[in-house]
Interface confidence: medium
């Protein structure tokens, strides 16, 4: 069963946000961080196939403005009562008998149920408040240290303008039950009979505290000589205006593709992917496009030697088992984006980083770009998925899941529509069912799965994670063996 919290958020947003303007919160852990007036950065996506993530920077708008004063009050919207229940049951039985001979009978039932009842309300900043706020206050001088760091990385900064929050503490429960029975009798001189039955029940409960943010909306900050707030962010607009000129690195430092100073590795990655093609039209938004993007990225890896691949894989396996190491590696590579030397790290993150830098501490773009892309994909996935990828890496069983995920992405086109696909037994090996690695990998992407006749119900919102899962499997697989 996938994340119960995410499922609830998905249902609430589907119901209350028809304009698609709200950004769903992806984990309960981060749900308290998104409050009106809070500043967030949009972590650029390493691919066109999954969405950027928003991350709190633990600052409020008042922290970057002077004179210092509390933020203006927010408006509380009316409450919505949200009730979502799901109850499904499948059962079947079979009996085989020949007159006066053996009898075999069996039955099975699977049921799934969940119910959620909650009150949700909105908190928003009145659009007119921004005008007043910016008229009465101006950017603090000297600039806040965090803003300086974000400026040097070229990150875009946003302010939360509206949130959807829970009114009371809510308990969300999902139950999954399986039952099976069988009996047989063999008539003869001595009659032999037997029967057996069993059941398995799985229950997942999550408590969402009162005041948890389920989804939020943002406006973009533009910082030039003073601050401006764009309530309708423009894709081309940047928070910090880039410096007029950027120096190029000398080739001996390994500058391919060359990175102008102040440009992030992520933007360099996009230039590398599009190779001069306008960003939107770089790859078609379907499985062929995703595969082409992944192949473009992994092309460089095919030339790397065995020793380096081994070092990289060992480090990546460690990073997949350690969320803190994953974050540390991401931060270190972000630091290297602005072309400064990268600080060495300990543990598995350090092992990966060591492969990506020259003796000067500068990143080698040919190596850093595929790893930044891979980390971008990995950050879309859950901790459970990371652990399963580490296990598949260790046991060299990446190809099976790669083919399965690829096949589903290909079959599910167009991704914007719900559909049901049956799974070819050849792709499942001998393990399918709750708890099987392939099942968990897909379940964690937010797909509805069927066990008795293996099938998958495609959910449009699973696209980002599924594409990221495919990219992660493909790159790890490419590093660990000969490309197919």
């Amino acid at each position: 069963m996938g994340s119960a919290f995410e499922r609830v958020v998905r249902r609430v947003v589907q119901e209350l946000d028809h304009g698609g303007e709200f950004i769903p919160v992806t984990s309960l852990q981060s749900s308290t961080g998104f409050q009106p007036y809070c500043l967030v950065v949009r972590k650029p996506s390493s691919s066109w196939f999954w969405k950027p993530r928003y991350k709190c920077v633990n600052l409020s708008i008042k922290d970057i403005l002077e004179p210092d004063a509390a933020e203006p009050d927010v408006q509380r919207g009316r409450s919505f009562h949200f009730y979502d229940a799901m109850d499904g049951q499948i059962q079947g039985s079979v009996e085989l008998a020949a007159p006066g001979q053996a009898k075999i009978a069996g039955g099975a039932a699977v049921s799934d149920s969940s119910s959620t009842s909650m009150n949700v309300y909105s908190l928003s900043v009145d659009p007119n408040t921004w005008q007043t706020l910016l008229h009465e206050r101006h950017l603090r001088q000297p600039e806040h240290k965090v803003l300086q760091q974000l400026r040097s990385r070229g990150d875009n900064v946003y302010v939360v303008t509206e949130v959807l929050q829970t009114q009371k503490e809510v308990e969300v429960t999902r139950t999954h039950k399986r039952e099976g029975s069988g009996r047989f009798s063999l008539p003869g001189a001595t009659c032999l009979q037997g029967e057996g039955q069993g059941h398995l029940s799985q229950k997942k409960t999550v408590t969402i505290p009162s005041g948890s943010t389920l989804a939020f909306r943002v406006a973009q900050l533009v910082i030039d000589s003073d601050l401006d707030v764009l309530l309708f962010p423009d894709k081309k607009q940047r928070t910090f205006q880039p410096p007029a000129t950027g120096h190029k690195r000398s080739t001996s430092e390994g500058a391919w593709p060359q990175l102008p100073s102040g440009l992030s590795m992520m933007r360099c990655l996009h230039n590398f992917l599009t190779d001069g093609v306008p960003a939107e039209g770089a790859f078609t938004e379907d499985f062929q496009g995703l595969r082409a993007e992944v192949e473009t990225i992994s092309k460089e890896l095919e030339l790397l030697d065995r020793e380096l691949c081994q070092l990289l894989l060992e480090g990546l396996e460690g990073v997949l088992r350690d969320q803190l190491a994953l974050r540390a590696l991401e931060e270190a590579l972000e630091q290297g984006q602005s072309l400064g030397p990268v600080e060495p790290l300990d543990g598995p993150a350090g092992a990966v980083l060591e492969c990506l830098v020259l003796s000067s501490g500068m990143l080698v773009p040919e190596l850093a770009i595929p790893v930044v892309y891979l980390l971008g994909a990995l950050t879309m996935l859950s901790e459970t998925q990371h652990k399963l990828l580490a296990e598949a890496l260790e046991s060299q069983t990446l190809l099976g899941p790669l083919e399965l995920v690829g096949s589903l992405l290909e079959q599910s086109a167009p991704w914007q529509e719900r559909s049901t696909m049956s799974l070819p037994p050849g792709l499942l090996g001998n393990s399918w069912g709750e708890g099987a690695p392939a099942w968990v990998l897909l379940d964690e992407c937010g797909l509805e799965l069927g066990e008795d006749t293996p099938h998958v119900c495609w959910e449009p919102q699973a696209q980002g994670r599924m594409c990221a899962l495919y990219a992660s499997l493909a790159l790890l697989s490419g590093l660990s063996q000969e490309p197919h």
Partner: nanobody
Framework: QVQLVETGGGLVQPGGSLRLSCAAS????????MGWFRQAPGKEREGVSC?????????YYADSVKGRFTISRDNAKNTVYLQMNNLKPEDTAVYYC??????????????????????WGQGTQVTVSS
Amino acid sequence: QVQLVETGGGLVQPGGSLRLSCAASGFTLDIYNMGWFRQAPGKEREGVSCISSRYGTSTYYADSVKGRFTISRDNAKNTVYLQMNNLKPEDTAVYYCATVSWRFTTNQDVCLTPSVSGYWGQGTQVTVSS
């Protein structure tokens, strides 16, 4: 713009020496295994020697050049060299350098197979004649 440029070729008498250089621009040479290949008129391209990236310590040579040729690299200069001593007329060919991959096998000869290479230079002519 990824480029490999070979220099140092020329006309030399049998028994003489030449030092070929392969300079890389637009990418970081030291993360790649590098190889030297040659193609004589009317013959197929063949592997001469290769050297592993900074992550390894291996050097391989074709039997025909063992003991006479030495491959080396200077990562700071983004350059790979081929020192050729005791040259013979059968060494006459256009010499190319290229990035090579032998990560998928422990067979030492695989790096000398042109098909596993990636980036290629435009070549430099070596003529051994009296």
